[in-house]
Amino acid sequence: FERTRSLQDPCSNCPAGTFCDNNRNQICSPCPPNSFSSAGGQRTCDICRQCKGVFRTRKECSSTSNAECDCTPGFHCLGAGCSMCEQDCKQGQELTKKGCKDCCFGTFNDQKRGICRPWTNCSLDGKSVLVNGTKERDVVCGPSPADLSPGASSVTPPAPAREPGHSPQ
């Protein structure tokens, strides 16, 4: 089949990194600078992805493979193939339309990306707060007060007036 196909279509003999040049009697010509063909038998080479602006080059374009971009420092990739970059924030912050903002009380973000999430409500699982939450860290839930025999632990349950998961202001 391959022999038959190549007799019918001389372009099928053109390897990756070349294109079948109709202007030159269908001979295989190398891809021009800043273009590539990743498969054989191509009639054109594709323009290389250009990594500039917020993007930086992770892998250079070659005659047989496209360039790959990632984001410049202070930004992180979003979307398939890093189609977009988004500004990093600090832990304890989230990105809003007006820039990086601290997490509201009762929420946290332990990454440089993403949104602030509510602290775990320990009482929903019948547990108590072992370590208070911060802007950067979730609360740590411990055993429920009923599970602790008197004097067995130095952890003091939060005062009844305070919601579980809240840290002192």
Epitope: I47, Q50, M84
Partner: antibody, heavy 119, light 106 residues
Framework: EVQLVESGGALVQPGGSLRLSCAGS????????MHWVRQAPGKGLEWVAD????????YYVDSVKGRFTFSRDNARNSLYLQMNSLRIEDTAVYYC????????????WGQGTLVTVSS | DIVMTQTPSSLSASVGDRVTITCRAS??????LNWYQQKPGKAPKLLIY???SLQSGVPSRFSGSGSGTDFTLTISSLQPEDFATYYC????????FGGGTKVEIK
């Protein structure tokens, strides 16, 4: 509030030179790539050039390479487009625009300045 | 260069109509496609970035879709202020704009 204001447009003869300026305000100027885009009378938009935040990287459309030079002065929050060997086909409104620094889109534009090349 | 072909070049529509503008790239550009609106004598205004993300402050009647080579800008219910010219722009490589689509009052 982000603002971009172009200036320097004028009537110039073919072969002449002109320098356009763009003043930016309301954002950290040096953090952003910036672009020039032009529009010939009654025609569509044509990207002309862009420049990195520190001015070390510059790219141009083929039709202006070797004739136009894009530069910036971050201390003055200003961009400059030095246009030499001007041709009749360079006649256009020239806009400066800010790269949004997320995917190559231009999120803020100036009001434009008209360059007319005619004898 | 990557050529961006917009269709139609102009269209007539009425207030309340659903309007669709298409943009085709001469090769795959993933989702590196942006849409702008321009009114006479004014600078372009960004509507959609990364093919489908709505720019802050732009009404939700504008939406974008597509990836690879074929992209669409849709105005779900045309308003009087939407009569303008719309441009697509690829940011995959050296930026290029489509030829524009003028939306006129029927």
């Amino acid at each position: 509030e982000v603002q971009l204001v172009e200036s320097g447009g004028a009537l110039v003869q073919p072969g002449g030179s002109l320098r356009l300026s763009c003043a930016g305000s309301g954002f950290t100027f040096s953090n952003f790539w910036m672009h020039w885009v032009r529009q010939a009378p009654g025609k569509g938009l044509e990207w002309v050039a862009d420049i990195s935040g520190d001015g070390s990287e510059k790219y141009y459309v083929d039709s202006v390479k070797g004739r136009f030079t894009f530069s910036r002065d971050n201390a003055r929050n200003s961009l400059y487009l030095q246009m030499n060997s001007l041709r009749i086909e360079d006649t256009a409104v020239y806009y400066c625009a800010r790269d949004a620094m997320r995917g190559g889109d231009l999120d803020y534009w100036g009001q434009g300045t008209l360059v007319t090349v005619s004898s | 260069d990557i050529v961006m072909t917009q269709t139609p070049s102009s269209l007539s529509a009425s207030v309340g109509d659903r309007v669709t503008i298409t943009c085709r790239a001469s090769q795959s550009i993933s989702s590196y496609l942006n849409w702008y609106q321009q009114k006479p004598g004014k600078a372009p205004k960004l509507l959609i970035y990364a093919a489908s993300s709505l720019q802050s402050g732009v009404p939700s009647r504008f939406s974008g879709s597509g990836s690879g080579t074929d992209f669409t800008l849709t105005i779900s219910s045309l308003q009087p202020e939407d009569f303008a010219t719309y441009y697509c722009q690829q940011s995959y490589s050296t930026p290029h704009f489509g030829g524009g689509t003028k939306v006129e009052i029927k």
